[in-house]
Interface confidence: medium
């Protein structure tokens, strides 16, 4: 059901039909669900070809990236957004997510965060989840607005299952990982638990359900006694170095 499909807490309206149906032009990737990309006639868009990672919102990108159209004015209907490198101090910005960690957007410029006068919970944009009555989105803007968490979430470290933006929002022993339509605090993996080995940095973006990384002193390796037909589907577990 593509009506009202959500991406990391954001609703995307007026999606083109999946799998290259009418309106789905080849090359115009639309992220229908966290990690599920429909592009042209291909069922999946993988990262093996080293293309930029398409996104619909900042949370789908790494902590040192933000989501935007590669060229100004290209983010209208059908325009593809990708993860771009964050902007350093004193660079131009339009929102906090564009600035690199430790900075925030003030008067259009990335400035160092001064937590003494700018509490963490207020660093995010003040447009807290207003998609429900966002007329622009309903009018056919194919991409969601950035959503943020209420500031109270930042005052105490998130417990297992609570919504987060990044791992530092979570209590000790937890990381922030994608789950359902948002990101939540999940337990860091223990020895013997199944882990996900990524082919390259950033490929975790294709997972609807992200696992945390392996705990201290552990590495994600192929389970030695796990034999399967294809190498690509071998089970990885957290193992001692």
């Amino acid at each position: 059901t593509l009506n009202s499909v959500l991406i990391n807490s954001n609703a995307i309206k007026n999606l083109p039909p999946p799998l290259g149906g009418a309106g789905g032009q080849p090359g115009s990737a639309v992220s229908v669900a966290p990690g599920v990309l429909y592009e042209g006639g291909n069922k999946y868009q993988t990262l093996d070809n080293y293309q930029p990672y398409p996104c619909a919102e900042d949370e789908e990108c790494g902590s040192d990236e933000y989501c935007s159209s590669p060229s100004r004015g290209a983010a209208g209907v059908g325009g593809v957004q990708i993860c771009l490198a964050c902007r350093k101090r004193r660079k131009r910005c339009m929102r906090h997510a564009m600035c690199c960690p430790g900075n925030y957007c003030k008067n259009g410029i990335c400035m160092p965060s001064d937590h003494s006068h700018f509490p963490r919970g207020e660093i995010e944009e003040s447009i807290i989840e207003n998609l429900g009555n966002d007329h622009n989105a309903a009018a056919g803007d194919g991409y969601p607005r950035r959503t943020t968490l209420t500031s109270k979430i930042y005052h105490t470290k998130g417990q297992e299952g609570s919504v987060c933006l990044r791992s530092s929002d979570c209590a000790a022993g937890l990381c922030c990982a994608r789950h359902f339509w948002s990101k939540i605090c999940k337990p860091v993996l223990k020895e013997g638990q199944v882990c996900t080995k990524h082919k390259r940095k950033g490929s975790h973006g294709l997972e609807i359900f992200q696992r945390c990384y392996c705990g201290e002193g552990l590495a994600c390796r192929i389970q030695k006694d796990h034999h399967q037909a294809s190498n690509s589907s071998r089970l990885h577990t957290c193992q001692r170095h």
């Epitope: 499909v5 229908v32 429900g132 979430i153 299952g161 359900f209």
Partner: antibody, heavy 116, light 111 residues
Amino acid sequence: QVQLVESGGGLVQPGGSLRLSCAASGFTFSSYWMSWVRQAPGKGLEWVSGISYSGSNTHYADSVKGRFTISRDNSKNTLYLQMNSLRAEDTAVYYCARMGIDLDYWGQGTLVTVSS
Amino acid sequence: DIALTQPASVSGSPGQSITISCTGTSSDVGGFNYVSWYQQHPGKAPKLMIHDGSNRPSGVSNRFSGSKSGNTASLTISGLQAEDEADYYCSTWDMTVDFVFGGGTKLTVLG
């Protein structure tokens, strides 16, 4: 401890309306997505609807789309399900569930019977 | 509609091990590598037993374990006990971000 208590179920005629409530306690309600799941008598579980932590984003199963509306009031720690144009096939026990690591906590359910 | 297929019933004697299977398609169980399992006693609410295919929430006995191979997920209960008698449901998400449950399996503990 986490507690979810549903209320508002009952007998209603086909085409009628009903509003279910789910009172949450024991956790920071506004930090979690919430869901409704139903179970027809003697049948399996069917996911009905989900709502984001602030309430602005909602998602529905095809079977209830356009008839049911999920909402929440974080100031009251309460989840709602407004059910309109009810049909006989909507007869079920309706559970509210917290969407943490999966549907990690469930209420005891409230029975909705649609019959003439 | 995407469906997850479970056996209608499974039985075992106390102390034995039993396995409940959950078969899906590449767009749900196989594609996402993510399955959860719920236990439901008669007249009670479901309880999460396994998430992420094989992880147990705190408070769940280590007699319960989950695994996945291809498009089939499995729940294994070792050292079967009388209180394990219940209905068990697998669930996952399909490509359209719908939450999908299996039809359920009734576990009977013999004797």
